[in-house]
């Protein structure tokens, strides 16, 4: 006489909310004589599924007639599944007896896991911006998802990033799962238009996976550059200081002019130029009148860029011993 | 797919303006730079200058600055090269071009351009 | 403005032929060289960047290269779908130029 085998053939299976799910569960003898039922779980605590011979299982239908004298089908459809649903299904062997059928023997079990998409992910930059060859942290983050397993990637301008970690939670049994990942990148000065990706891929994706991006001009300042020219003496005295601003991000700047340590003039960055890597460049004039100079006059420029500290360039517009002299003759 | 699709030929006096348009579908518009390139009948390519849709941001050759202006609608993404005065020399294939990436590299921020339109042919005849 | 010269202008080769064009630049580039075929009536195609990197979708019988002012392309065994004109480009600095091209006819 063939020994009973009870056969649930798939370990795993993934259903998605409102789907039906069938769980297959065959037996290769009619022997001994009694039913088979189905529960979740294992131990006292275990839930009974479907019951043919009493109960009221709505949800449930089975697949084969039972009713068959010779049926070794047990398999069953769980429709509409929430996710409530999730767990390990056994379909159990029990041996007719008096006053009580007796458990005979149970399947491997099946376990039945939600199939849900994760949501799109979301990537968030720094707090505050930093400078070129610094590194900043980016963090991207997916939930919703189940079965657990999934992978994330990073990228800066589609290139693998290798520097981050990531994180799944809950660690144990969950209906559904979050991710979070947070990848470090240095900061090129280069960097103002280019963009980090996370990108997540999930079995519920069939290989077309979710990409969250986000731009890292939101995430780096580059200090300016500073260039201050003296133009030759013209017609009247009179000296053009141009002062250039090269090379910064993002474009709020103020400059401010001291002659001899006093403020002659304030400006905010206004018409400037934008460089093809996004950089921006400014360029002010001041008109200096050199006549009625007795000294040499000391002429700074003060850049305050994003709120950083002021940066100071100066520059010593000699008088000549002529003017010198004549400005003292003036006074007497 | 990414395609650039370009408006129709046009036929223009000397003097006058022309405004070629230039629609992008099938990637982020405002990405990656469109450059202009012309071709006159049986000559080689010539480069005219290229825009930042994002920014807005242009750069031309230096022989066409003053008389072309390029700009963007970024809500039909669409990118227009206007010049004006036009003079028969100007008789060309009009080609806009996406760059091949839309980030800089520590060595540049120009690319070569790997996505065509059809051509434009503007004809100036008096 | 970087000149870019491109020989020879014109060439005549068979089907199966290895074809050779070569583009110097008036100044060292790197290697920010395109190269791109143009058939009568169409748009110019990307081929190589970089000098030597095959474009997406681009056989693998195009292949480039050099570095600085000295560059290459090459059709290893020309085909009846080859029969264009080439043009190198060199992206290091604005303006963006192109050589004068180079005509492949049928023999």
């Known amino acids: 006489e063939e020994e009973l085998q009870m056969i649930q053939p798939e370990k795993l299976l993934l259903v998605a909310v409102g789907e039906s799910a069938t769980l297959n569960c065959t037996v290769t003898s009619l022997l001994p004589v009694g039913p088979v039922l189905w529960f979740r779980g294992v131990g006292p605590g275990r839930e009974l599924i479907y019951n043919q011979k009493e109960g009221h299982f709505p949800r449930v239908t089975t697949v084969s007639d039972l009713t068959k004298r010779n049926n070794m089908d047990f398999s069953i459809r769980i429709s509409s599944i929430t996710p409530a649903d999730a767990g390990t299904y056994y379909c159990v062997k029990f041996r007719k007896g008096s006053p009580e059928n007796v458990e005979f023997k149970s399947g491997p079990g099946t376990e039945m896991a939600l199939r849900a998409k994760p949501s799109a992910p979301v990537v968030s930059g720094p707090a505050a911006r930093a400078t070129p060859e610094h590194t900043v942290s980016f963090t991207c983050k997916s939930h919703g998802f189940s079965p657990r397993d999934i992978t994330l990637k990073w990228f800066k301008n589609g290139n693998e990033l290798s520097d981050f970690q990531t994180n799944v939670d809950p660690a144990g049994q969950s209906v559904s799962y979050s991710i979070r990942s947070t990848a470090r990148v240095v900061l090129a000065p280069w960097d103002v238009r280019s963009q980090v990706t996370c990108e997540v891929a999930h079995v519920t994706l069939q290989g077309d996976p979710l990409r969250g991006t986000a731009n890292l001009s939101e995430a780096i300042r580059v200090p300016p550059t500073l260039e201050v020219t003296q133009q030759p003496m013209r017609a009247g005295n009179q000296v053009n200081i141009t002062y250039q601003v090269r090379n910064f991000y993002p474009q709020n700047l103020q400059l401010t002019w001291l002659e001899n340590g006093n403020v002659c003039r304030t400006e905010t960055a206004s018409t400037l130029t934008e460089n093809k890597d996004g950089t921006y460049n400014w360029t002010s004039w001041l008109l200096v009148n050199t006549s009625d100079q007795r000294d040499d006059v000391v002429l700074t420029c003060q850049v305050k860029h994003d709120g950083q500290l002021a940066v100071n360039k100066s520059l010593v517009l000699e008088v000549s011993a002529h003017q010198k002299d004549q400005s003292s003759d003036a006074t007497h | 797919q990414v395609q650039l699709v370009q408006s129709g030929a046009e036929v223009k006096k000397p003097g006058a303006s022309v405004k070629v348009s230039c629609k992008a579908s099938g990637y982020t518009f405002t990405r990656y730079d469109i450059n202009w390139v012309r071709q006159a009948p049986g000559q080689g390519l010539e480069w005219m200058g290229w825009m930042n849709p994002n920014s807005g941001n242009t750069g031309y050759a230096q022989k066409l600055q003053g008389r072309v202006t390029m700009t963007r609608d970024t809500s039909t993404s669409t990118v227009y090269m206007e010049l004006s005065s036009l003079r028969s020399e100007d008789t060309a294939v009009y080609y806009c071009?996406?760059?091949?990436?839309?980030?800089?590299?520590?060595?540049?921020?120009?690319?070569?351009?790997?996505?065509w339109g059809q051509g434009t042919l503007v004809t100036v005849s008096s | 403005d970087i000149q870019m010269t491109q020989s020879p202008s014109s060439l005549s080769a068979s089907v199966g032929d290895r074809v050779t064009i070569t583009c110097r630049a008036s100044?060292?580039?790197?290697?920010?060289l395109g190269w791109y075929q143009q058939k009568p009536g169409k748009a110019p195609k990307l081929l190589i960047y970089s000098a030597s990197n095959l474009q997406s979708g681009v056989p693998s019988r195009f292949s480039g290269s050099g570095s600085g002012t000295d560059f290459t392309l090459t059709i290893s065994s020309l085909q009846p779908e080859d029969f264009a004109t080439y043009y190198c480009?060199?992206?290091?600095?604005?303006?963006?130029?192109f050589g004068g091209g180079t005509k492949v006819e049928i023999k």
């Open positions: 071009a996406r760059e091949r990436v839309g980030y800089c590299s520590s060595t540049s921020c120009l690319h070569p351009l790997d996505y």
């Open positions: 480009q060199q992206s290091y600095d604005v303006p963006l130029t």
């Open positions: 100044q060292g580039i790197r290697n920010d």
